[in-house]
């Protein structure tokens, strides 16, 4: 059974992940120059189901494509450091989902733009955090 300390640690990690995802989304949305619309041509894959920490496997598998899109953004004077940011997210995701059980991600038929993708995982984090508090 999870202890209060492990629950607290999970909550803090989720909050960190949430902040990172929100920072990327805000960076896209707040960047007034619509030159970044080219990022919207990239396709992201969404989980068929995302209700448990193990479903973060689906996010982990999309981190490399996310980094590639952010690299394009950076070349257009978008001030995020994609490699560092994605590396941080990857570490948190690996800790949260655990490596004890191998989970095969199932993807939904519908794909998403980077904005839709980030919003989906932000909602996931918020949902899990709310069950822990």
């Amino acid at each position: 059974a999870p202890t209060s300390s492990s629950t607290k640690k999970t909550q803090l990690q989720l909050e960190h992940l949430l902040l990172d995802l929100q920072m990327i989304l805000n960076g896209i949305n707040n960047y007034k120059n619509p030159k970044l619309t080219r990022m919207l041509t990239f396709k992201f894959y969404m989980p068929k189901k995302a209700t448990e920490l193990k479903h973060l496997q689906c996010l982990e598998e999309e981190l490399k494509p996310l980094e590639e899109v952010l690299n394009l953004a950076q070349s257009k004077n978008f001030h995020l450091r994609p490699r560092d940011l994605i590396s941080n997210i990857n570490v948190i995701v690996l800790e949260l989902k655990g490596s004890e059980t191998t989970f095969m991600c199932e993807y939904a038929d519908e794909t998403a733009t980077i904005v839709e993708f980030l919003n989906r995982w932000i909602t996931f984090c918020q949902s899990i955090i709310s069950t822990l508090t």
Epitope: K35, L72, T111, V115
Partner: antibody, heavy 122, light 108 residues
Amino acid sequence: EVQLVQSGAEVKKPGESLKISCKGSGYSFTSYWIGWVRQMPGKGLEWMGIIYPGDSDTTYSPSFQGQVTISADKSINTAYLQWSSLKASDTAMYYCAREGFGESIHYGLDVWGQGTTVTVSS
Amino acid sequence: SYELTQPPSVSVSPGQTARITCSGDALPRQYAYWYQQKPGQAPMLVIYKDSERPSGIPERFSGSSSGTTVTLTISGVQAEDEADYYCQSADSSGTYVVFGGGTKLTVL
């Protein structure tokens, strides 16, 4: 009404220079990328390059890099495509088109000009 | 350079279903767009984001995607649908826009 209006047909001789135009109206011209597309007689569409009129940032297709120059004058909402020395093989229809977008979606080339016919012949 | 491959021609009888395919290595990661071009006219967007229809485009036009192939489907084809159809996407870096070679749809 959102529209792109292109300059009229041109007949030129090989070696001459040419600049054709594409004027946008009905939207914020500086906030949307404008692309140029070539269509040679009886052939398909070829993407030449694109410009962001807000700051004139430009990307060329590798096939057209160094062959043409894409520019824009945001004060008069107009994008340009120019040649310094025309060749017979430049004979084609040239279209300008706007890259449309929304808050979280990219609409592709959603508005097109009517096209400018360029004929290069001695 | 990156290429999108389309069949040169597709023929179909009125009322039947026409399917036009477009294949490219980057299509699993880049959205596709479809344009209709009738003789003497500028191209017109008929599908964006693989499967979305702009306002004013009839419901018989639909798009789908599977792996490295996207498909434009025209259900209950009408004589007025006879035209050239082009798919368009971007290379894997998102830097360059690319068109397919075009497909001539003939309504028999």
